[in-house]
Every structure is written in structure tokens, then in C-alpha cells.
């Protein structure tokens, strides 16, 4: 939560923003509120982005004013016009892209004064439900060493990967994780666990998106002897 104040002495108003994360490939909201004014025509909202020359969005005299809008935001931004009068200056951003991440400023002018607050906007893409593969995947016996691969796709930013056994005990040894960006900058993650089989065992991987606070789970359960095992099992 960031609260900003105007810098014009007594003519200052409180502007409040909330740091947020947007899902790549969806519409996002950049939250900003301010002390409301009784006349819509007296309210000016300007959204700016650090490192961007033009405006992200401007709303004044009760309507959008887009003549100074930067090219990268053309056709993509909107304020909630009917809620401006009650102090909502939040911005809707269409089709959030990886490049939309950054520091934004919500700048407000009303008849009471001016104020602004910065907002840190992060972008992320959720990881897919992991697919689990086992090698070798048949004729397994207790004591055999197997490699279990957990694969999850099209996430951003890079994931954190955790392995655990059926009792929830973390498995940290013999884990190799690789992450590769595709042409769109999204990551595919492959994590390999080498483990010596017990009589029965459940092995789970958790792929965590640190920006979206999203967890994707996959697990494989190896039971009974002898075993036949499907090439892919989903949790």
C-alpha cells in the first residue's frame, strides 16, 4: 500500500495505490484511489509509467483525453468513468504483456489540490499443471534408482520448484531443475528428481510462481511389486 500526498502545501490530497500483479494475456487492474471531489469536471487523472515518454492514460472534465497517450498503450486502457466521482482512479489494462511491468504513477488533480502515488506493477503467467514422467517406467523394484521428471509450461517469471515425499518431507538432494524461455519470453520448467525406490512411494513436485503466488502440483504414486506404470500421471 502506497499513500502519496500532494506537494503544494495546504493544497494536497491523499492518493493511495496498491502494488499488484497482472496475468499476462488477460486484462489487469492498476488500483488507485483518492479523496473524492463533488464535481466530476474538476477531476483530472493521469497515469504515467517510468521510462515511457507519453501518458498511459488521461481522464479530465469527465472524459478520456488520449491525445498525449503513448503508442504502447493505445487502445488498451480505461478508467472506470462512473466511479471516478467516488474517488476511484483505477486503470484497466487490456491484454497485459510482460513489458507492462514497471513503476506507474497515479497523479490526481481536484478542486481540493493535487496528489500522486507510485505503484509497482508486476506481470506473470501461471504455470500449467505439471506432467510427471518416470524413467524407467516398468519392471521396477524396491531399491531401483529412478528419475522422475516434473514438467510445467508457459509461466512467467521463472518458477520455484519443490519436491516432497508422501509424508510431506522435502526432497532436496539429487534434484536438477532447468528453465527455458520460449519465443514469447514465457518459461518451460523441467525438474528431475533421482530417487531410490522404497516399497511404496508418492513423489510430488510443486511449481510455484513467485509473482502470482500460484502453485501448480503434480505427483506420482508407485505402489506394489511388480509395477506397471503409465507414462504420465496427473495429480
Amino acid at each position: 500500500l502506497i499513500i502519496g500526498f500532494g506537494i503544494s502545501g495546504r493544497h494536497s490530497i491523499t492518493v493511495t495505490t496498491v502494488a499488484s500483479a497482472g496475468n499476462i494475456g488477460e486484462d489487469g487492474i492498476l488500483s488507485c484511489t483518492f479523496e473524492p471531489d463533488i464535481k466530476l469536471s474538476d477531476i483530472v487523472i493521469q497515469w504515467l509509467k517510468e521510462g515511457v515518454l507519453g501518458l498511459v492514460h488521461e481522464f479530465k472534465e469527465g472524459k478520456d483525453e488520449l491525445s498525449e497517450q503513448d503508442e504502447m498503450f493505445r487502445g488498451r486502457t480505461a478508467v472506470f468513468a462512473d466511479q471516478v466521482i467516488v474517488g476511484n482512479a483505477s486503470l484497466r489494462l487490456k491484454n497485459v504483456q510482460l513489458t507492462d511491468a514497471g513503476t506507474y504513477k497515479c497523479y490526481i488533480i481536484t478542486s481540493k489540490g493535487k496528489g500522486n502515488a507510485n505503484l509497482e506493477y508486476k506481470t506473470g503467467a501461471p504455470y500449467s499443471k505439471p506432467s510427471m514422467t518416470l524413467e524407467p517406467n516398468k519392471d521396477l523394484r524396491p531399491g531401483d534408482t529412478v528419475t522422475i521428471t516434473c514438467s510445467s509450461y508457459r509461466g512467467y517469471p521463472e518458477a520455484e520448484v519443490f519436491w516432497q515425499d508422501g509424508q510431506g518431507v522435502p526432497l532436496t538432494g539429487n534434484v536438477t531443475t532447468s528453465q527455458m524461455a520460449n519465443e514469447q519470453g514465457l518459461f518451460d520448467v523441467h525438474s528431475v528428481l533421482r530417487v531410490v525406490l522404497g516399497a511404496n512411494g508418492t513423489y510430488s513436485c510443486l511449481v510455484r510462481n513467485p509473482v502470482l503466488q500460484q502453485d501448480a502440483h503434480g505427483s506420482v504414486t508407485i505402489t506394489g511389486q511388480p509395477m506397471t506404470f503409465p507414462p504420465e500421471a496427473l495429480w
Partner: antibody, heavy 115, light 109 residues
Framework: EVQLVESGGGLIQPGGSLRLSCAAS????????MNWVRQAPGKGLEWVSV???????YYADSVKGRVTISRDNSKNTLYLQMNSLRAEDTAVYYC?????????WGQGTTVTVSS | EIVLTQSPGTLSLSPGERATLSCRAS???????LAWYQQKPGQAPRLLIY???SRATGIPDRFSGSGSGTDFTLTISRLEPEDFAVYYC??????????FGQGTKLEIK
């Protein structure tokens, strides 16, 4: 060259099913909002469905529960699965990319629902 | 649901004249999410204007868009023979996610 090419239209009986395809070239389908828009003979444009880059989908009330929009990222192709077809579904179906607006359209594929 | 109403339904003008097409929304629409399209018989629509006033790539400067809130206008300053077609306005962002106006037919007088 940025291009969309629809296929899969045809004559179908009421209650039948059809799958329309839209092959994209010159850009990546999964990075854009991709739409299906239809136009009944002599009528205006009617939005049918959208799939966001994230995979989230939305539908017009007139088709909700009867159509499914999807995509195959590996084929860079958009689909519209249409079930329980009615006479009023007769139209030219266009796929369209939405960046800042619907800036790229296919040539359309005709669906005729008739017994 | 936002309804877009275009007027007039049909506009009869001569080449060289100025055309003014109106699009009125039943509730406020963000200027960023308002677009205009041109469609000729047997062809797919073509994007003319996005963000209420920005010309799409390759669109001649005789086409201009303006307006905000609930009232939007497409103006063709000097009609060329190839401009006679049907014009649609369209909004994004409310339920349903996209809405088109019913169209204005621009015909040769």
C-alpha cells in the same frame, strides 16, 4: 505476412455439429485475444466468442453452452466447436485478432444450417 | 449490456461530400475501447479507427474519429468512390465482452 484463413464451414442439419478452424500466420495466436465474429445473411456483425492469451474464454449469450472456442498453440490455429446448431446460426463466420482492436480478419467461412 | 446505436441507418451522399456517422452507447464506453470498421459486399470488415480517434495502419487521413463517453463520430472529410460501404462501431470491455452497432450504410446519391 500477417494472415488468418478460416475453414470448416458447410451445410449442416439442425441439431448437428461443426468445427471451424482458423489458421494464423505471421503472428502467434496465443499472444493475442482471438475472436470469432459472425454475420447472418443481410445482417450486421455479431460477436460470438473470444479466447484470451491466458486461455480464458468468453461467449455471447446467444451461443453460450453450444459453442467452445479453443486453440492449438503448436499449430497456431484457432477453433470454434459448434453443437446443437440452429437455423439462426446460419452466417459467415470470421476469426479476428484483437490487439488494440480487431485489426486482422480472415476471409470468412460460411455455415448454413438447414434441413 | 451496452447497446451501440448507429445513425443514420442509411446515408446517401455524393463523392466529394463530407460524411458524418454517429455511434451512441447506452452507457459510458472508454474511448480506448471504441473502434470503427468498414465492410464492403463479400469482404471481411476492415479496421479504420481504434481508440476512438487513432487511424489504423494504411487508413487515409480523410477518415477521422472523435467523441467520448456515450457519443462517438466517424467523419469522412471528402468521399471517394471506394468509401461507399457499411460502417460499424464496436466496443470492448463490458458484458458481453464485445458489442457492434447495427451498422450505417453509406450509399451513392
Amino acid at each position: 505476412e500477417v494472415q488468418l484463413v478460416e475453414s470448416g464451414g458447410g451445410l449442416i442439419q439442425p441439431g448437428g455439429s461443426l468445427r471451424l478452424s482458423c489458421a494464423a500466420s505471421g503472428f502467434t495466436v496465443s499472444s493475442n485475444y482471438m475472436n470469432w465474429v459472425r454475420q447472418a445473411p443481410g445482417k450486421g456483425l455479431e460477436w460470438v466468442s473470444v479466447i484470451y492469451g491466458s486461455g480464458r474464454t468468453y461467449y455471447a449469450d446467444s451461443v453460450k453452452g453450444r459453442v467452445t472456442i479453443s486453440r492449438d498453440n503448436s499449430k497456431n490455429t484457432l477453433y470454434l466447436q459448434m453443437n446443437s446448431l440452429r437455423a439462426e446460426d446460419t452466417a459467415v463466420y470470421y476469426c479476428a485478432r484483437d490487439t488494440y482492436a480487431m485489426d486482422v480478419w480472415g476471409q470468412g467461412t460460411t455455415v448454413t444450417v438447414s434441413s | 449490456e451496452i447497446v451501440l446505436t448507429q445513425s443514420p441507418g442509411t446515408l446517401s451522399l455524393s463523392p466529394g461530400e463530407r460524411a458524418t456517422l454517429s455511434c451512441r452507447a447506452s452507457q459510458s464506453v472508454s474511448s480506448s475501447y471504441l473502434a470503427w470498421y468498414q465492410q464492403k459486399p463479400g469482404q471481411a470488415p476492415r479496421l479504420l479507427i481504434y481508440g476512438a480517434s487513432s487511424r489504423a495502419t494504411g487508413i487515409p487521413d480523410r477518415f477521422s474519429g472523435s467523441g467520448s463517453g456515450t457519443d462517438f463520430t466517424l467523419t469522412i472529410s471528402r468521399l471517394e468512390p471506394e468509401d461507399f460501404a457499411v460502417y460499424y462501431c464496436q466496443q470492448y470491455g463490458s458484458s458481453p465482452m464485445y458489442t457492434f452497432g447495427q451498422g450505417t450504410k453509406l450509399e451513392i446519391k
